[in-house]
Interface confidence: medium
């Protein structure tokens, strides 16, 4: 049997059963999540669940830029350091940069400091690039 690889929306890229859209426009975390949802297909801000997934995403983004952080779908909605993925994925893989998690920083970004392989927490109202994800 021929197994066809699912296709992603134009401008999105495919990796291991998921489609990813990298958006180089400035949105705060909640607006970024709303915009991801607006693209349909059950899209949300991206969950990153393995080093392999992180590496693939990082390589793609580095082709565009290496200096600006990018919102992902990890947040701390209760503001109690109880982080969760907005798409409901299990919070098992972790890649925090080791910086302080204190203050009013309850949304996660891929940090440009380590080629987008590690995460930092930031204030959710900051306007940054963002990464969406859905399963086709």
């Amino acid at each position: 049997d021929i197994i066809m690889r699912p296709s992603c929306a134009p401008g999105w890229f495919y990796h291991k059963s998921n489609c990813y859209g990298y958006f180089r426009k400035l949105r705060n975390w909640s607006d970024a999540e709303l915009e991801c949802q607006s693209y349909g297909n059950g899209a949300h801000l991206a969950s990153i669940l393995s080093l392999k997934e992180a590496s693939t995403i990082a390589e793609y983004i580095s082709g565009y830029q290496r200096s600006q952080p990018i919102w992902i779908g990890l947040h701390d909605p209760q503001k109690r350091q109880q982080w969760q993925w907005i798409d409901g994925a299990m919070y098992l893989y972790r890649s925090w940069s080791g910086k302080s998690m204190g203050g009013n920083k309850h949304c996660a970004e891929m940090s440009s400091n380590n080629n987008f392989l590690t995460w930092s927490s930031n204030e959710c109202n900051k306007r940054q690039h963002f990464l969406c994800k859905y399963r086709p």
Epitope: R24, L26, N28, E35, S38, Y64, Q65, S67, R127, H129
Partner: antibody, heavy 118, light 109 residues
Framework: QVQLVQSGAEVKKPGASVKISCKAS????????IHWVRQAPGQGLEWVGI????????NYAQKFQGRVTLTRDTSARTVYMEMNSLRPDDTAVYYC???????????WGKGTLVTVSS | FMLTQPHSVSGSPGKTVTISCTGS????????VQWYQQRPGSAPTTVIY?????PSGVPDRFSGSIDRSSNSASLTISGLKTEDEADYYC?????????FGGGTKLTVL
């Protein structure tokens, strides 16, 4: 359809203040950021600042920091730009422009001419 | 961060013109580029957003592209018409702040 209706022309003396408005219709007001851009006579476009209509938080171009204030009135679906300590070189058309999902800045107001002259 | 455009370009009806927009530092691909058309006495209108997307109502004679090797964006207008005569501005963002090019006057000969 989306419309941004701006207030009428203003003539001010140097040192005075001006407050102009941008009334939005045709969409959910608090969903989209509003930018302000100005254009001096015969010159190019210059970004002034941006406001989040959900909560008065605003950012300004460095040259306008401390002299421009962006505010909003949700019930009136209106965003305001106030500029203090006006100078003759502030004479310009001031435009508001709306960000959108996907498309950025597709919707613009028609502009408000502010003339600063003694 | 600055965006540099040629002061003016010209072309004959039916021909193709390209307007460039070069970034002064960093990568032009770091943030999306928009293009605005402004006819005399009118407000700007968006002809290209997010590098190469056209708002509805903008003819497909208008196209946008990014060239990372020259760190520049381009607006190409094919099948020139007299109504295309206008000023064209590129725009991008530098983290929180928005930046415009100086504008290019397109003359249709």
């Amino acid at each position: 359809q989306v419309q941004l209706v701006q207030s009428g022309a203003e003539v001010k003396k140097p040192g005075a203040s001006v407050k102009i408005s941008c009334k939005a219709s045709g969409y959910t007001f608090n969903r989209y950021y509003i930018h302000w851009v100005r254009q001096a006579p015969g010159q190019g476009l210059e970004w002034v600042g941006i406001i989040n209509p959900r909560g008065d938080s605003a950012n300004y171009a460095q040259k306008f920091q401390g002299r421009v204030t962006l505010t909003r009135d949700t019930s009136a679906r209106t965003v305001y730009m106030e500029m203090n300590s006006l100078r003759p070189d502030d004479t310009a058309v001031y435009y508001c422009a709306r960000e959108g999902v996907g498309a950025t800045w597709v919707h613009w107001g028609k502009g408000t001419l502010v003339t600063v002259s003694s | 961060f600055m965006l540099t455009q040629p002061h003016s370009v010209s072309g004959s009806p039916g021909k193709t013109v390209t307007i460039s927009c070069t970034g002064s530092s960093g990568s032009i691909a770091s943030n999306y580029v928009q293009w605005y058309q402004q006819r005399p006495g009118s407000a700007p209108t968006t002809v290209i957003y997010e590098d190469n997307q056209r708002p509805s109502g903008v003819p497909d004679r208008f196209s946008g592209s990014i060239d990372r090797s020259s760190n520049s964006a381009s607006l190409t207008i094919s099948g020139l018409k007299t109504e295309d005569e206008a000023d064209y501005y590129c725009q991008s963002s530098d983290t929180m702040f928005q930046v415009f090019g100086g504008g290019t006057k397109l003359t249709v000969l």
